[in-house]
């Protein structure tokens, strides 16, 4: 990747990622410098007859750093603080080639939950107020509610009326998605409304 257009790479929290390095064809490489947010990460001197000299200059990421045979950078056990700008400078006898990357760390979605604040009206219509959540949600998480393949809401919240006298059994499904994972959780309108009905009759007695 040229320095003008960084390659955006997605990494998953806790997993590994490789920033691919392309070599100038047919040229002998003198050394390679890897930088993270403009700070030196590693300095590599390739050798034709023996293993390369690898000097890791950033102790914070050092134990999680590895390099492939082509000196691509491998970073394991990814942390949120690994997010940022990476650059590789390949120096040959005649030129210096720069490759730029932007690494963004995404979380696998976990622990989807639905909370219910529903109420029963005197005409026995049940109004469902459902809220969907996942652990550590950020702005890259998309929520939606579906029933029978139709999207009823594009937000974590769903408000819908359900009348047991005219509606058949209905499941409402929350789907939470980001670029690397998706989770879903279904609730039964009949079950939720029966619970509300029990509470309603209990308070009337």
């Amino acid at each position: 990747q040229s320095s003008l257009t960084p390659l955006m790479v997605n990494g998953i929290l806790g997993e590994s990622v490789t920033l691919p390095l392309e070599f100038p064809a047919g040229e002998k490489v003198n050394f390679i410098t890897w930088l993270f947010n403009e700070t030196s990460l590693a300095f590599i001197v390739p050798h034709e007859t023996k293993s390369p000299e690898i000097h890791v200059t950033n102790p914070k990421q050092g134990k999680r750093l590895n390099f492939t045979q082509s000196y691509s950078l491998q970073l394991s056990n990814l942390k949120m603080e690994d997010t940022g700008s990476y650059r590789a400078q390949i120096s040959t006898k005649t030129s210096a080639k720069l490759s730029s990357y932007t690494l963004r760390i995404l979380r696998q979605l976990r622990n989807i939950q639905v909370t219910n604040h529903s109420q029963l009206f005197q005409n026995m219509t049940c109004e469902l107020h459902l809220t969907c959540s996942v652990e550590d949600a950020d702005d890259n998480v998309s929520f939606r509610w579906e029933a029978l393949g139709n999207t009823l809401s594009s937000q974590p919240n769903l408000t819908v009326s359900w009348d047991p006298r005219i509606s058949s059994e209905q499941d409402y499904t929350c789907i939470a998605e980001n670029a690397v994972s998706n989770l879903s959780f279904s609730v039964s309108a009949q079950k939720l409304c029966e619970d509300v009905k029990i509470q309603y009759t209990d308070t009337k007695m």
Epitope: N140, R144, T151, S154, Q155, N157, T159, V160
Partner: antibody
């Protein structure tokens, strides 16, 4: 049927403020996020951000933090975009667009032209 | 932010010809949406989640792709298809649109 109807064109002087409205009908307003998109003359589309129509919480793209404000009046199913301290570069057509999920904008307002000129 | 590059910027074709519009993302995205816009009008939803046609969109349109490369194809151009087409990603905030491909009559 489902539709979004926006307020009419506005001609404003630099430094003034403008408030664009977007009235929704034909669906449950509080179930779908409302997005705002800018299109400057001869330019492409630029996503400004969105507002959660249930909670009223706005989210702004970095380029639209500061002078831009999204708000709601749920009683009349209307979303608003307010721009303060108007500049010449705010001259554009502003669209509201409903999010159907996965930030797919399935219904758009007709657009409101805001012209900033001294 | 994820940058979407559409190519070509302009496609000059005759009715009946096949049109292939490309959208390349600077980072892998899970799906792509497409919109059509005609002069003086709001964009119209065209294809959602890579390959699903929006309501009322004719079957001569199709969408495909994955990762960083997505395509909108029109199998045989009709006069009403000449317009600007935008791709849009949802995987990362800010949601971004491509620069558009203008399909014009040759």
């Amino acid at each position: 049927q489902i539709q979004l109807v926006q307020s009419g064109s506005e001609l404003k002087k630099p430094g003034a403020s403008v408030k664009v409205s977007c009235k929704a009908s034909g669906y449950t307003f509080t179930n779908y996020g409302m997005n705002w998109v800018k299109q400057a003359p001869g330019q492409d589309l630029k996503w400004m951000g969105w507002i959660n129509t249930y909670s009223g919480e706005p989210r702004y793209a970095d380029d639209f933090k500061g002078r831009f404000a999204f708000s709601l009046d749920k009683s009349v199913n209307t979303a608003y975009l307010q721009i303060s301290s108007l500049k010449a570069e705010d001259t554009a057509v502003y669209f509201c667009a409903r999010d159907y999920g996965r930030w797919y904008f399935d219904v758009w307002g007709q657009g409101t032209t805001v012209t900033v000129s001294s | 932010q994820i940058v979407l590059s559409q190519s070509p910027a302009t496609l000059s074709l005759s009715p009946g010809e096949r049109a292939t519009l490309s959208c390349r993302a600077s980072s892998s995205v899970s799906h792509m949406h497409w919109y059509q816009q005609k002069p003086g009008q709001a964009p119209r939803p065209w294809i959602y989640a890579t390959s699903n046609l929006a309501s009322g969109i004719p079957a001569r349109f199709s969408g495909s792709g994955s990762g960083t490369d997505y395509t909108l194809t029109i199998s045989s151009l009709e006069p009403e298809d000449f317009a600007v087409y935008y791709c849009q990603q949802w995987s990362s905030t800010p949601r971004t649109f491509g620069g558009g491909t203008k399909v014009e009559i040759k």
